[in-house]
């Protein structure tokens, strides 16, 4: 499907050097494309600002855990 082939890829070239409070975070998405130079996380804040972060950093991993748990629903 040609549209998918030409879909734009979002990459992160620099990471925030500041820890962001989880209370300010609304969601995240991972950048896993091989077309990008770095493995990255993009956090979206509650005011819809997008911030690139380094997934190797513990605060980033803890923030992703926190956001994941907010999506949790009982499974049967």
């Amino acid at each position: 499907q040609p549209d998918a082939i030409n879909a734009p890829v979002t990459c992160c070239y620099n990471f925030t050097n500041r820890k962001i409070s989880v209370q300010r975070l609304a969601s995240y998405r991972r950048i896993t494309s091989s077309k990008c130079p770095k493995e990255a996380v993009i956090f979206k804040t509650i005011v819809a600002k997008e911030i690139c972060a380094d997934p190797k950093q513990k605060w980033v991993q803890d923030s992703m855990d926190h956001l994941d748990k907010q999506t949790q629903t009982p499974k049967t």
């Epitope: 896993t32 803890d62 855990d65 994941d68 949790q72």
Partner: nanobody, 123 residues
Framework: EVQLVESGGGLVQAGGSLRLSCAAS????????MGWFRQAPEKEREFVAV????????SYSNSVKGRFTISRDNAKNTVYLQMNSLKPEDTAVYYC????????????????WGQGTQVTVSS
């Protein structure tokens, strides 16, 4: 690109135990939520267990709760599923998955999957 390889499956009698392992390579293991799923013949793939990146939180499907335990060793890039008191209905192919996208137990939020390991529980 993360590669996942499961091991530890096999044939066991009802009431027995197995420990599945999933070794990861090619990415930052501690940055992925890890899950186990299973698929029995003629059935859809179903969620079994999930563990957070830190290992501090996990949850299970009701069908395995109290019998299965998920754990991880970030230093060894490995996630485990200890399965006790196995039942014939636990027979399935068990898949390890790495969750890159925001979510919890939904298969669609797991970007990377292993090839699976067969678990057969005889009565």
């Amino acid at each position: 690109e993360v590669q996942l390889v499961e091991s530890g499956g096999g044939l066991v009698q009802a009431g027995g135990s197995l420990r599945l392992s999933c070794a990861a390579s090619g990415g930052t293991f501690s940055s992925y939520r890890m899950g186990w799923f299973r698929q029995a013949p003629e059935k859809e793939r179903e969620f079994v267990a999930v563990i957070t990146r830190s290992g501090g939180s996990h949850s299970y499907s009701n069908s395995v709760k109290g019998r299965f335990t998920i754990s991880r060793d970030n230093a060894k890039n490995t996630v485990y599923l200890q399965m006790n008191s196995l039942k014939p209905e636990d027979t399935a192919v068990y898949y390890c998955a790495a969750g890159a996208q925001m979510g919890w137990a939904e298969a669609s939020t797991y970007d990377y999957w292993g090839q699976g390991t067969q678990v057969t529980v005889s009565s």
